[in-house]
């Protein structure tokens, strides 16, 4: 019994005087305890507690139930205590099922022992399966068995406290161990969209997907810069074991421009926390932005291909879409795509494919693109570039050489005179007049340009080269003249000079 | 069929002359140009200069007057080159090449087969 | 002094088309002229005029010109078009010749 000094407050004594006590099924449990501020008698095994004022605790037939721990308190709330064993070879572990372990802690298996002196005390699993090899465990026969640092695996393993009696195994009723898991990763949140584009009116409907080890993790829909609540509907399902999902879908049901901005997805659990936005944007009405992925001025060679290709934006979807020359629509040559197949995507190319371009077919290119709230349009200014072509080479009645040629860009015309007894000539020829004609075709068309030279400066028998070039090529044309007495012979103008 | 044949592979020490000569046969020989063209060994073409072979005035590029002679001989329809004073550097092919045409529209149509001269001391 | 600049060198798979350029400030006026040379060393003018066959060359040699940069495509190649090949063109008030410095053409 506890000693104290004089004139301090002591525990109160309990009779008999053990720590624990045995006594058999049916026997008689008689426990005294003495204390001049005696205040109750509390008896307490797994989740049952029972109170007694009477100084004395008298249980005439005890039962395996009985078996718990028996206190003494007075009105110091100074306390004593005694374990009973009620020793039933019936009845050799009183246990409470549910059994329940955060991973990484101890939980305890509670199947305490009616009777201390059977052996080897200790975890089994179920139908004779042996336990996980890292499962470790610390027996008490108060209290039951300790299994130290609970891991994930153990989830829903099936055990049993065991005794040997007799030389016998004896098993209790069986456990099954739920364990709860430790948030060891921030929960895993996704948006079903990143970004909305809506027009005024239009329902906002976003779902946000939370996923993590247990329900247990947090979650909200918050409003950046914003401390409103927001209006949210969930669902959730276990996927298995630690394999937790929850929706959380906000809406807003007729959204308004000022409605725009960021939305977050916020979760957090013990372990940190992990956040997902989209973007909201709301317009007043529909719009289309065109972009020329090209020059809109275009040169191209004769004869050869140009593509014109624009990307634009359309919101809502394009509805009509278009490319136009002189009036003219184009059924085919060009195609019209969406740039992404991402279900958000406003973003769109269109493609017209101009193949083998004659000099005629310059001019303006217009894409056409509506919905059902804008059109837009963009135009392109194609110019062929040709090969200068001679349209005229004569001699005119004042004695002039003339040579007409056409092309784009505009051609420059040489002039070279060889006599007759030359083989090879370098002498170029200035000329007395040149101009730049005015076009009767289109804009965009060729131009043309009319070089002069006086073959009165010509003494002697010979050719006469006009030769007119530019960017894309060359083309010549040939005089050839002869002296007959003092008059010049009527010139023969010839395309080919062949050697 | 038109032919230009040339004379065969010489051997000449620095300082000393070379006469090549272009035969041409199957063509009026007055009525085209005569071109003359270089080559070193492992090099590329390089232009000399031609003769008028109506009135047999020669026109010379700027690296090839000087030692450098064309000549004609008409009555054979034979173009003749002569290089004097030979150095290491006029070790080449030279070949022979007939022309028509104005300004820049010609084309040297006929080759010889190229003669050979090395100068080596 | 002038120059017509031509890759040293460029190969072609039998059968393909293959595109050998020169590049000239007077090509844009002046008319280019391609040769070949085989290694036998014999030499044939395949196109004259930027786009002109002699007669007797085949009709897989084309030619063209723009800009400054003038262009001999062979189609179909074969085996016997393995060569050097030389632009010429002119250049100055006098217009003197001047070869490019070839292109040396290996067919794979």
């Known amino acids: 019994q506890p000693s104290v000094s004089p004139g301090e407050p002591s525990p109160p004594s309990i009779h008999p005087g053990k720590s624990d006590l045995i006594v058999r099924v049916g026997d008689e449990i008689r426990l005294l305890c003495t204390d001049p501020g005696f205040v109750k008698w509390t008896f307490e095994i797994l989740d049952e507690t029972n109170e007694n004022k009477q100084n004395e605790w008298i249980t005439e037939k005890a039962e395996a139930t009985n078996t718990g721990k028996y206190t003494c308190t007075n009105k110091h709330g100074l306390s004593n205590s005694i374990y009973v064993f009620v020793r039933d070879p019936a009845k050799l572990f009183l246990v409470d099922r549910s059994l329940y372990g955060k991973e990484d802690n101890d939980t305890l298996v509670r199947c305490p022992l009616t009777d201390p002196e059977v052996t080897n005390y200790s975890l089994k699993g179920c139908q004779g399966k042996p336990l996980p090899k890292d499962l470790r465990f610390i027996p008490d026969p108060k209290a039951g068995i300790m299994i130290k640092s609970v891991k994930r695996a153990y989830h829903r393993l099936c055990l049993h406290c065991s005794v040997d009696q007799e030389g016998k195994s004896v098993l209790s009723e069986k456990f099954i161990l739920k364990v709860r898991p430790a948030f060891k990763a921030v929960p895993v949140v996704s948006v079903s969209k990143a970004s909305y584009l809506l027009r005024e009116g239009e329902e906002f409907t976003v779902t946000c997907t939370i996923k993590d080890v247990s329900s247990s993790v947090y979650s909200t829909w918050k409003r950046e810069n914003s401390q409103t609540k927001l209006q949210e509907k969930y669902n959730s399902w276990h996927h298995g074991d630690f394999n937790y999902e929850r929706q959380a879908t906000l809406t807003i049901s007729s959204a308004r421009v000022n409605d725009s901005g960021v939305f977050m997805c916020y979760a957090n659990n013990t372990f940190g926390s992990a956040n997902v936005t989209t973007t909201l944007e709301v317009v007043d009405k529909g719009f289309i932005n065109i972009f020329p992925m090209i020059n809109t001025t275009v040169f191209v060679n004769d004869g050869e291909n140009v593509d014109l290709i624009v990307e634009y934006e359309a919101f809502p979807k394009p509805e009509h879409q278009q490319w136009i020359y002189m009036n003219r629509t184009f059924t085919d040559k060009w195609e019209d795509y969406p740039k992404s197949e991402n279900e958000s995507n406003i973003r769109y190319v269109s493609e017209l494919h101009l193949t083998r371009l004659k000099g005629t077919e310059g001019g303006t290119y217009t894409f056409l693109v509506s919905n059902s709230d804008v059109n837009a349009a963009i135009a392109f200014n194609v110019y062929v570039n040709t090969k200068p072509e001679i349209l005229t080479y004569d001699r005119l009645v004042n004695g002039m050489l003339q040579c007409v040629a056409a092309g784009f860009p505009e051609p420059t015309i040489d002039w070279y005179f060889c006599p007759g007894t030359e083989q090879r000539c370098s002498a170029s020829v200035l000329p007395v007049d040149v101009q730049t004609l005015n076009s009767s075709g289109p804009p965009f068309g060729k131009l043309v340009v009319q070089s002069s030279i006086d073959s009165s400066a010509f003494k002697h028998n010979g050719t006469v080269e006009c030769k007119a070039y530019n960017d894309v090529g060359k083309t010549s044309a040939y005089f050839n003249f002869a002296f007959k007495g003092n008059n010049k012979e009527q010139i023969h103008p010839h395309t080919l000079f062949t050697p | 069929q038109i032919q230009l044949v040339q004379s065969g592979p010489e051997l000449r020490k620095p300082g000393e002359s070379v006469k090549i000569s272009c035969k041409a046969s199957?063509?009026?020989?007055?009525?085209?140009?005569m071109y003359w063209v270089k080559q070193a060994p492992g090099k590329g073409l390089k232009w000399m200069g031609w003769?008028?072979?109506?009135?047999?005035?020669?026109t010379y590029a700027d690296d090839f007057k000087g030692r450098f002679v064309f000549s004609l001989e008409a009555s054979a329809n034979t173009a003749n080159l002569q290089i004097s004073n030979l150095k290491n550097e006029d070790t080449a092919t030279y070949f022979c090449?007939?022309?028509?045409?104005?300004?820049?529209?010609?084309?040297?149509?006929?080759w010889g087969q190229g003669t050979s001269v090395t100068v080596s001391s | 002094s002038y120059e017509l600049i031509q890759p040293p060198s460029a190969s072609v798979t039998l059968g393909n088309t293959v595109s050998l350029t020169c590049v000239g400030d007077?090509?844009?006026?002046?008319?280019a002229q391609w040769y070949q040379q085989k290694p036998d060393k014999t030499i044939v003018s395949v196109i004259y005029?930027?786009?002109e066959r002699p007669s007797g060359i085949s009709d897989r040699f084309s030619g063209s010109s723009s800009g400054t940069t003038a262009t001999l495509t062979i189609h179909g190649t074969l085996a016997e078009d393995e060569a050097d090949y030389y632009c010429?063109?002119?250049?100055?008030?006098?217009?003197?010749?001047?070869f490019g410095g070839g292109t040396k053409l290996t067919v794979l």
């Open positions: 090449a007939r022309a028509r045409g104005l300004v820049d529209d010609y084309v040297m149509d006929a």
């Open positions: 199957g063509y009026t020989f007055t009525d085209y140009a």
């Open positions: 003769i008028n072979t109506y009135t047999g005035k020669p």
């Open positions: 007077e090509l844009s006026k002046r008319y």
């Open positions: 005029k930027d786009s």
């Open positions: 010429l063109s002119t250049y100055s008030d006098d217009n003197l010749p001047v």
